[in-house]
């Protein structure tokens, strides 16, 4: 989905390259072709990253942190390409790289600023804590520190608690919101400004449904067009909350178009799925089916949560028998 890295051109022979943690990047450098090519890549003007001259690499003095992580485009050197292929970047690799290129004709130096970002896919969770209900937007690993915003019924909320833990190379962030007793819709946005990547979580509470025992119930789950892109891989999970924890009833993977159903009374309409409608039916209701049903549609860019509350009441027959 994302390019190897992207370049931002800035003045003075200096480029900015933005890479993602643990991915490979290219530090660009070009020169006017000539004979006797010498290429020296250095980090922060001190550490030897890669040296090439007299037709081959010379890595005897290479700083150990770059061992087995760098290479040049050897077939393209004679065409003026001195770019460095850099494997598995870490946050410690951030900084200024200087490429020295010499030929029998001239010597040039190019500077490349490497910035590294992290954005492991965030999640939106719905949790019950005693009598309180919480929505939690969280991201396990992110760098630099993201911008988190909450909206209620499309209106920004100023209250924004952020629980942050910093590790050596990234932040882990939780942003909980107490939604006890609310029927509003909520939206949480997490933005990584460096990687220009935004993730959105949306939560909607549907009106409660009252059903009689032995009946069936249809619960709707249709993605909001603003976020949903059928070309992008996503996962749909239906689950039911019992005594504070969710158990998975069924899930669907768009990549394989697989549906896995864990509850025999659960059914999905294949034709509706093909139209991106993930509404489900639960047959032959019994009293223990009362509770909250959660539809979760998730991709790399969004999570859409839809909550249904179902009340199953005894049928007249059952009541008269008792």
């Amino acid at each position: 989905i994302f390019p190897l890295a992207f370049f931002i051109y800035v003045p003075m022979n200096e480029q900015i390259v933005i890479g993602r943690l643990d991915e490979d990047i290219i530090l660009p450098s070009s020169f006017e072709r000539g004979s006797e090519v010498v290429i020296h890549w250095k980090y922060q003007d001190s550490y030897k990253v890669h040296s090439y001259y007299k037709g081959s690499d010379h890595l005897e003095s290479q700083d150990p942190r770059y061992a087995n992580r760098t290479s040049l485009f050897y077939n393209e050197i004679q065409n003026g390409n001195a770019s460095l292929f850099f494997r598995r970047v870490s946050l410690l690799d951030e900084g200024i790289y200087t490429c020295y290129v010499g030929t029998a004709i001239q010597v040039i130096t190019n500077k490349v600023v490497l910035k590294v970002g992290v954005f492991l896919t965030p999640v939106m969770k719905y949790e019950k804590r005693n009598t309180n209900s919480f929505l939690i937007c969280s991201v396990l690993s992110v760098y630099p520190r993201p911008i988190i915003t909450w909206k209620m019924d499309n209106t920004p909320i100023s209250e924004n608690n952020m629980e942050e833990t910093g590790s050596l190379d990234s932040f882990s962030i939780n942003s909980p919101l107490n939604i006890t007793g609310s029927n509003s819709s909520y939206e949480c946005t997490i933005e990584n400004s460096l990687l220009k990547q935004t993730w959105t979580g949306r939560w909607t509470m549907k009106d409660g449904l009252h059903k009689m025992q032995s009946e069936h119930v249809s619960l709707s789950c249709q993605p909001v067009n603003d976020y949903f892109s059928p070309n992008q891989d996503f996962k749909v999970t239906w689950s039911r909350m019992k005594s504070g924890t969710f158990s998975v009833l069924a899930y669907y993977l768009s990549s394989s178009q697989n549906t896995i159903i864990n509850e025999s009374r659960f059914s999905w309409n294949k034709e509706l799925i093909n139209q991106s409608d993930f509404s489900m039916n639960l047959m032959d209701l019994n009293l223990s089916d009362s509770g909250e049903y959660l539809c979760n549609i998730s991709s790399d860019e969004y999570t859409l949560l839809t909550i249904h509350t179902v009340h199953v009441e005894p049928s007249q027959e059952t009541a008269s028998h008792n």
Partner: antibody
Framework: QVQLVESGGGVVQPGRSLRLSCAAS????????MHWVRQVPGKGLEWVAV????????DYADSVKGRFTISRDNSKNTLYLQMNSLRVEDTAVYYC?????????????WGQGTLVTVSS | DIQMTQSPSSLSASVGDRVTITCRAS??????LAWYQQKPGKVPKLLIY???TLQSGVPSRFSGSGSGTDFTLTISSLQPEDVATYYC?????????FGPGTKVDIK
């Protein structure tokens, strides 16, 4: 055009020290490796030492290893040769010379040389 | 360390003669060899690099050849201004040793 001007030569007693300097102009000094080469008057050329463009690597002839130190100040466009524990056989004209590129090639420009005489 | 030898150590030839100087490395140095000319009382001047590439401004009567351990410098037609000592130098890796030189003069 490239200009290299050596200084600091003179007469010195064995065991003493001397520091040679080489002022560079007419090219971007910090981009090029530099060498010191010496020549006993009437004899052949002897390569002495090299320093890379960024001073990250230095190499010496066996005959001077441990006694001579090559260094550079890129902000002053100057190359140095610190000569310690001088011997009679170090008597020579010392040439400062520019490498083709970073310090791993041949010499493409030479200074006029400065004479060092080690004598008791 | 690799040793460099040159032969002959000196030669006399007539103007217009073809002159050949050889340089031998004790181990292979690919084509990382340069030739210098030093006229009496002057500083050395680069003639040839990469064993056979003529430095710009050097007359075409000078040529170089060879690879590995054996190299030659040829002056196709000796001129009076070619009276000098000629040195080879290896530059495959430090130390960048010079040969002992070949002195060329005119008969």
């Amino acid at each position: 055009q490239v200009q290299l001007v050596e200084s600091g030569g003179g007469v010195v007693q064995p065991g003493r020290s001397l520091r040679l300097s080489c002022a560079a102009s007419g090219f971007t000094f910090s981009n090029y490796g530099m060498h010191w080469v010496r020549q006993v008057p009437g004899k052949g050329l002897e390569w002495v030492a090299v320093i890379w463009y960024d001073a990250s690597e230095k190499d010496y002839a066996d005959s001077v290893k441990g006694r001579f130190t090559i260094s550079r100040d890129n902000s002053k466009n100057t190359l140095y040769l610190q000569m310690n524990s001088l011997r009679v056989e170090d008597t020579a004209v010392y040439y400062c010379a520019k490498d083709l590129i970073s310090g791993i090639y041949y010499v493409d420009h030479w200074g006029q040389g400065t004479l060092v005489t080690v004598s008791s | 360390d690799i040793q460099m030898t040159q032969s002959p150590s000196s030669l006399s030839a007539s103007v217009g003669d073809r002159v050949t100087i050889t340089c031998r490395a004790s181990q292979g140095i690919s084509n990382y060899l340069a030739w210098y000319q030093q006229k009496p009382g002057k500083v050395p001047k680069l003639l040839i690099y990469a064993a056979s590439t003529l430095q710009s401004g050097v007359p075409s009567r000078f040529s170089g050849s060879g690879s590995g351990t054996d190299f030659t410098l040829t002056i196709s037609s000796l001129q009076p201004e070619d009276v000098a000592t000629y040195y080879c130098q290896k530059y495959n890796a430090a130390p960048f040793t010079f040969g002992p030189g070949t002195k060329v003069d005119i008969k």
